[in-house]
Interface confidence: low
């Protein structure tokens, strides 16, 4: 079964992505994912979660970083980098900017 | 240093549509961590908030001015315009462009130097 | 959405310290700590002087201070200099989509 949407307190997190409505959001706690999809950079964006904790707890891998943490704005200036593959030049930054 | 540089027609008719364009220099629009808006302020008066939107187009407006405003981006070419509708001799002002910066400041860091439009026939 | 409350004037003596208040709602200066003040001189853009309430970027001189109380915001100018004369808006976050600026505060330096 899907988590249940949390129904602690709310926290304010920075809220950058397609899919923001303003500057910050708010919700059971704040997150950064990174993700690298096939042939392109690594898009970082930053939000509120509510459902689906236990990705927090997921190990980074070359294709997807997700962070989350618990405090006000936590995730605001917060910068991700993907597990390096098995070429270290390879490896992708960040790009949170 | 990134710059903001406002351009567009300085005078126009009442019930036509206001057209304005902001060009980023200097850094990219589609940096994710900025939200560009445009801010108003009639002659004598103080300064209105009229819109902002985010490099992927999600837009959000003034409520008193939404039925009339629409704001887009075009990261091809670092820009992001302004569009009015119906004007009339209210809507004279001038008006900035501006980046919200919500990495490091929390507040429109860069303004444009203002370009003043003025709705008259 | 309505503007944030601001005094028309302010005035003091070169040397002397100013506050001007910026009074809202708990939907936009009591709910957010995004406040901000601007300075604008006549014909020239506005330049930001404090973000996130309390916070001078680089450049700004320390004389320049915020503070919040509740749902009030305050800009002080200490040791006014005849250069600080100038309107001062401020502005906040209010929501989800939504930005509100104040009306705006005439500073003179007597």
């Known amino acids: 079964d899907p988590v249940k949407p949390s129904r602690g307190p709310l926290v304010t997190c920075t809220c950058e992505s397609p899919h923001c409505r303003g500057p910050t959001c708010q919700g059971a706690w704040c997150t950064v994912v990174l993700v690298r999809e096939e042939g392109r950079h690594p898009q970082e964006h930053r939000g509120c979660g509510n459902l689906h904790r236990e990705l927090c707890r997921g190990r980074p891998t070359e294709f997807v970083n997700h962070y989350c943490c618990d405090s006000h704005l936590c995730n605001r200036n917060v910068s991700l980098v993907l597990e390096a593959t098995q070429t270290p030049s390879e490896q992708p930054g960040t790009d949170s900017q | 240093q990134l710059q903001l540089q406002e351009s567009g027609p300085g005078l126009v008719k009442p019930s036509e549509t206001l057209s304005l364009t902001c060009t980023v220099s200097g850094g990219s629009i589609s940096s994710r961590s900025y939200y560009w808006g445009w801010i108003r302020q009639p002659p004598g008066k103080g300064l209105e908030w009229i819109g902002n939107i985010y490099y992927s187009g999600s837009a959000f407006y003034n409520p008193s001015l939404k039925s009339r405003v629409t704001i887009s981006v075009d990261t091809s070419k670092n820009q992001f315009s302004l569009k009015l509708s119906s004007v009339t001799a209210a809507d004279t002002a001038v008006y900035y462009c501006?980046?919200?910066?919500?990495?490091?400041?929390?507040?429109?860091?860069?303004w444009g130097q203002g370009t003043m439009v003025t709705v008259s026939s | 959405q309505s503007a944030l409350t601001q005094p028309p004037s302010a005035s003091g003596s070169p040397g002397q310290s100013v506050t001007i208040s910026c009074t809202g709602t708990s939907s936009d200066v009591g709910g957010y700590n995004y406040v901000s003040w601007y300075q604008q001189h006549p014909g020239k853009a506005p330049k930001l002087m404090i973000y996130?309430?309390?916070k001078r970027p680089s450049g700004v001189p320390d004389r320049f201070s915020g503070s919040k109380s509740g749902n009030t915001a305050s800009l002080t100018v200490s040791g006014l200099q005849a250069e600080d004369e100038a309107d001062y808006y401020c502005?906040?976050?209010?929501?989800?989509?939504?930005?509100?600026f104040g009306g705006g505060t005439k500073l003179t330096v007597l």
């Open positions: 996130e309430v309390s």
């Open positions: 502005t906040s976050f209010a929501g989800s989509n939504n930005w509100v």
């Open positions: 501006a980046r919200w910066d919500n990495w490091d400041v929390g507040a429109f860091d860069i």
